[in-house]
């Protein structure tokens, strides 16, 4: 079943290569287990950036060695992606799945365009 997911259109990463955005979903039921996946779309290729699963009211558990961190509050997930470089500029899509209890719902946001600018190297000081 489809579910609406909202996320900002554009985010600019900071000078340390960190970008944060909120992924909000319109929960049709009372989900107790939620899964969030961040996908990156570039040149019509979609790759998984990170994935987290959590019980409502608990911390997000990011799977594998993740470059993402995050927190949840109600139907909002605050996502932070670290270690970004200019080459990582692209569209980052938030996918939310309500895993438990049935029925299963899935929603995909329109994506957040994250712009990353590599910092200029500091000039040598004499």
């Amino acid at each position: 079943k489809a579910m609406h997911v909202a996320q900002p259109a554009v985010v600019l990463a900071n000078s340390r290569g960190t970008a944060s955005f909120v992924c909000e979903y319109a929960s049709p039921g009372k989900a107790t287990e939620v899964r969030v996946t961040v996908l990156r779309q570039a040149d019509s290729q979609v790759t998984e950036v990170c994935a987290a699963t959590y019980m409502m009211g608990n911390e997000l558990t990011f799977l594998d060695d993740s470059i993402c961190t995050g927190t949840s509050s109600g139907n909002q997930v605050n996502l932070t992606i670290q270690g970004l470089r200019a080459m990582d500029t692209g569209l980052y899509i938030c996918k939310v799945e309500l895993m438990y209890p049935p029925p299963y719902y899935m929603g995909i946001g329109n994506g957040t365009q994250i712009y990353v600018i590599d910092p200029e190297p500091c000039p040598d000081s004499d």
């Epitope: 107790t32 959590y54 019980m55 594998d64 209890p101 049935p102 029925p103």
Partner: antibody, heavy 123, light 107 residues
Amino acid sequence: QVKLQESGAELVRPGASVTLSCKASGYTFTDYEMHWMKQTPVHGLEWIGVIDPETGGITYNQKFKGKATLTADKSSSTAYMEFLSLTSEDSAVYYCTRRGARATVYNYVMDYWGQGTSVTVSS
Amino acid sequence: DIVMTQTTASLSASVGETVTITCRASENIHNYLAWYQQKQGRSPQLLVYNAKTLGDGVPSRFSGSGSGTQYSLKINSLQPEDFGSYYCQHFWSTPWTFGGGTKLEIK
């Protein structure tokens, strides 16, 4: 001990419908999801769908939406699957299975299976 | 849908040997994988879940491993009762699909 007792083998005519049952015992029926599987020599094992007996919430595999209807009766600790408009493609062994934990992250597993119900569709 | 591929449809081995059965997912399933054993005319029985956790009462000669898209089930020192079919199943996104199975036969 946990037991899932499925109904007996069925021989049905094409176009007919059949209802399979799965009686659970040895645990609290409403504490665990009940899933249904189909097994054929050609397509192997396929996941049909899941029902939460507590809430009645259901998720179907899109492939079986409109073909299978899942229900659960809390008073008799029995799950049912109705299969509609049967064709030869529906001839298979059907299993009810219990998911091994109620909504705990990572506990995704079918820990108990019924003995299976053989359905043969033939005129 | 995620496609689970067990490339080896059948393999034969002798009692006492060690065998490894593999399963590949079409996308990262983050260890959300179970292995089942099925004997002829019987229902599947749980062996391993979360890719590497043994089910209750499963002998320690069975072990699961893998990550991402590649997973395997290893059986050390095969016993006569280990012969049958083995299936993997993912639990990432619905529908929760199975591999086509690997039939383990006595050599």
